[in-house]
């Protein structure tokens, strides 16, 4: 009988272990992308930006999905989303329409079921890139911890795309859950 | 029998609350490095800063070690890297040789394996100086989302830093480990 | 026999998976705060920001208590910290005093045992805000990982505080509990 | 070719002004800081001033402070050095010298004009 | 104001013979410190930076070591086009201040 018993016992912990280190993988989705250069959209008004490598360098997605540009929410959960974005321009690149620049980030979040789109997180700054310096460079960076329920959408737009610093260190976003909804 | 079942039950909830407990904190490195002023090198390109506080004041480090300038990771994860650079200049500082100057930060990734350096994070700003102000101040903040392996090497290199901030709320680094790699 | 011994397996997979989920929530205090735009203090100097919303749009709050303008630590644990500024000024808000300007922001942590405020975090830049532009912006954010108490308190100071910018997507800062202290 | 040269020298009397020259060619001008290095006659070198790149930071030893004045136009790739209140132990070779690239804070020079002399004398 | 003692003041030798110049500093100075060359009627050339950083151009023979006050000029074989006088300086303060010079002669 306590040979049985230790036997179960073994069998409870064993498969505990490997239920908890299972749960614990798979409740934490989380997404590295970082800009797709070959696909940058021109403008200097608000854009958005859709091309973002997901599998390449230090871009990777576990339990979340990349669609149409947009990172979609999986699973329910409290995330840590983050983004930075360089921009820069060398005067070899040719003459800036302005010297006064506002370069910006807003990481939204899209709820399908309620078609609106809101602003979580913002930042950047107003600039003013004269023709005295050869080169030129700002980065932004924004985080924050948020609420996201499963098949929501996260994107990013920023002003000036075209001054977009194409390197995988410098232009990215990501997102992490931190913990599940009450 | 009855009363050694609920033994053992107690004997299976009480070590897995132990173990639960212990596999957490040992499954969660971390570090928060901050700047030693004592030695900061010069020089105005990119530069490794080799010297950091990981037991006084802010700065700690837990299952991840330091060594020869570099935070080495122990164990294998995904982790959340961030640093925090500020840069300051007041007119009783020195003879500043420049208004135009590029303050950078860059998060590096060394494998001792491959022999190989990579950049995970960039951040900055070309920034204009002048004179006709006494003092001048510029933080830079980057983060993101890691697959690190046990035996790679987290390292900073910034430009001008003869211009940090030597303040441990202004000039540092960390780590956290957010989870196991599948 | 063995069916009493499956029952109470069950019994403790319940209980377990039960007790991990409910620790494993509980654990995690967060906090996501955003800045109160009818009660913005004026000045230039250092001033702390004692208005924000913890539990309405994007702010919430678990686990920890919001009082007196003060996030307050109701768990002993590691957690990260973070803090997204964002300043503006638009020509039709009437002339700047100054069209220099420093603005920064700081994250402190008082301790009610020992009186004492230090800071975790500082950020920012000096900034020329020329009347040569109509609109100026600039944005800090500052992150990192620190040990914190039950009964401590985190609190944001900035500069120049009638600059903010009052939406919810611009002025915020948090914390998430990472892991516990050994 | 990098070069410098100095113009402007010439014998004035104690208490009286010159103003010297340096005209850069073969680099980029705008991006370095420059200085005005003397020797006397038969002596070691003195730095006597230094500019910042775009011309908002000046630079003097006590010894001209107040009496000195360094500016620069940079669209001109020029440098100026505005001698007053003139004394005998300001008789030397003034050198126009470009600082280096290197630590913001840490000033030598790589390259040196062949100098212009001042000689202050009643 | 940091000041600089450089020696000797003057020296002379023979062609392929090592030549060795010292530079005190008043205060620490790091690794903060340049050597120059001034031939006779010329303007002075930069040699060395930064203690032992050789300038673009400039042969090895020529070298610079110490850090903090104590610093090391060589010439590891002199030749005959080496003759001049020779100056430090630190740049590691404003007001960048000058040895007094060594001048090398050649036997």
């Known amino acids: 009988g306590s040979q049985h018993i230790r036997a179960e016992k073994a069998m409870v912990d064993g498969s505990w272990l490997d239920l908890a280190k299972r749960s614990k993988l798979e409740a934490q989705p989380f997404a590295h992308l970082t800009i797709n250069a070959t696909d940058i959209p021109s403008g200097s008004h608000k854009v958005s930006l859709s091309s973002w490598y997901h599998d390449r360098g230090w871009g990777k997605i576990s339990n979340m999905t990349f669609s149409n540009g947009k990172l979609i929410v999986n699973q329910d959960g409290f995330y840590y989303l983050y983004a930075n974005i360089c921009f820069r321009h060398h005067e070899t690149s040719g003459d800036l329409a302005t010297e006064y620049l506002q370069l910006m980030v807003y990481v939204t979040k899209t709820s399908i079921k309620i078609p609106s789109s809101h602003t979580l997180m913002k930042g950047g700054s107003t600039k003013y890139w004269s023709g005295n310096s050869e080169f030129h460079f700002y980065s932004i960076n924004v985080g924050g911890f948020f609420k996201l329920r499963s098949g929501e959408e996260i994107s990013i737009e920023v002003s000036n795309p075209s001054l977009l610093d194409p390197d995988q260190d410098a232009t990215y976003f990501g997102a992490f859950k931190v913990r599940d909804i009450d | 029998g009855s009363q050694h079942i609920r033994a053992e039950k107690a004997m299976v909830d009480g070590s897995w609350l132990d173990l639960a407990k212990r596999s957490k904190l040992e499954a969660q490195p971390f570090a928060h490095l901050t700047i030693n002023a004592t030695d900061i090198p010069s020089g105005s390109h990119k530069v490794s800063l080799s010297s950091w506080y990981h037991d006084r004041g802010w700065g700690k480090i837990s299952n991840m070690t330091f060594s020869n300038g570099k935070l080495i990771v122990n164990q294998d994860g995904f982790y959340y890297l961030y640093a925090n650079i500020c840069f300051r200049h007041h007119e009783t500082s020195g003879d500043l040789a420049t208004e135009y100057l590029q303050l950078m930060v860059y998060v590096t990734k060394t494998s001792i394996k491959i022999p190989s350096s990579h950049t995970l994070m960039k951040g900055g700003s070309t920034k204009y100086w002048s004179g006709n102000s006494e003092f001048h101040f510029y933080s830079i903040n980057v983060g993101g989302f890691f697959k690190l392996r046990s035996g790679e090497e987290i390292s900073i290199e910034v430009s001008n830093p003869s211009l940090l901030d030597p303040d441990q709320d202004a000039t540092y680094f960390g780590a956290f480990k957010v989870r196991d790699i599948d | 026999g063995s069916q009493h011994i499956r029952a109470e397996k069950a019994m403790v997979d319940g209980s377990w998976l039960d007790l991990a989920k409910r620790s494993k929530l509980e654990a995690q205090p967060f906090a996501h705060l955003t800045i109160n735009a009818t009660d913005i203090p004026s000045g230039s100097h250092k001033v702390s920001l004692s208005s924000w919303y913890h539990d309405r749009g994007w702010g919430k709050i678990s686990n920890m208590t919001f009082s007196n303008g003060k996030l307050i630590v109701n768990q002993d644990g590691f957690y990260y910290l973070y803090a997204n500024i964002c300043f503006r000024h638009h020509e039709t808000s009437g002339d700047l005093a100054t069209e220099y300007l420093q603005l920064m922001v700081y994250v402190t942590k008082t301790s009610i045992k020992i009186p004492s405020s230090h800071t975790l975090m500082k950020g920012g830049s000096t900034k020329y805000w020329s009347g040569n532009s109509e609109f100026h912006f600039y944005s800090i954010n500052v992150g990192g990982f620190f040990k914190l108490r039950s009964g401590e308190e985190i609190s944001i100071e900035v500069s120049n505080p009638s600059l903010l910018d009052p939406d919810q997507d611009a002025t915020y800062f948090g914390a998430f509990k990472v892991r516990d202290i050994d | 070719e990098v070069q410098l040269v100095e113009s402007g020298g010439g014998l004035v009397k104690p208490g009286g002004s010159l103003r010297l020259s340096c005209a850069a060619s073969?680099?980029?001008?705008?991006?370095?800081?420059m200085s005005w290095v003397r020797q006397a006659p038969g002596k070691g070198l003195e730095w006597v001033s230094g500019?910042?790149?775009?011309?908002?930071?000046?630079y003097y030893p006590d010894t001209v402070k107040g009496r000195f004045t360094i500016s620069r136009d940079n669209a001109k790739n020029s440098l100026y050095l505005q001698m007053n209140s003139l004394r005998a132990e300001d008789t030397a070779v003034y050198y126009c010298?470009?600082?280096?690239?290197?630590?913001?804070?840490?000033?030598?020079?790589?390259?040196w004009g062949k100098g212009t002399t001042v000689t202050v004398s009643s | 104001d940091i000041q600089m003692t450089q020696s000797p003041s003057s020296l002379s030798a023979s062609v392929g013979d090592r030549v060795t110049i010292t530079c005190k500093a008043s205060?620490?100075?790091?690794?903060?410190i340049a050597w120059y060359q001034q031939k006779p009627g010329k303007s002075p050339k930069l040699l060395i930076y930064?203690?032992?950083y050789r300038y673009t151009g400039v042969p090895s023979r020529f070298s610079g070591s110490g850090s903090g006050t104590d610093f090391t000029f060589t010439i590891s074989s002199l030749q005959p086009e080496d003759l001049a006088t020779y100056y430090c300086?630190?740049?590691?303060?404003?007001?960048?201040?000058f040895g007094g010079g060594t001048k090398v002669e050649i036997k």
């Open positions: 500019i910042s790149s775009g011309g908002t930071y000046t």
């Open positions: 205060q620490d100075v790091r690794t903060s």
């Open positions: 073969g680099f980029t001008f705008r991006n370095y800081a």
């Open positions: 930064s203690a032992s």
């Open positions: 010298a470009r600082r280096d690239y290197g630590d913001v804070y840490e000033w030598y020079f790589d390259v």
């Open positions: 300086q630190q740049h590691y303060s404003s007001p960048w201040t």
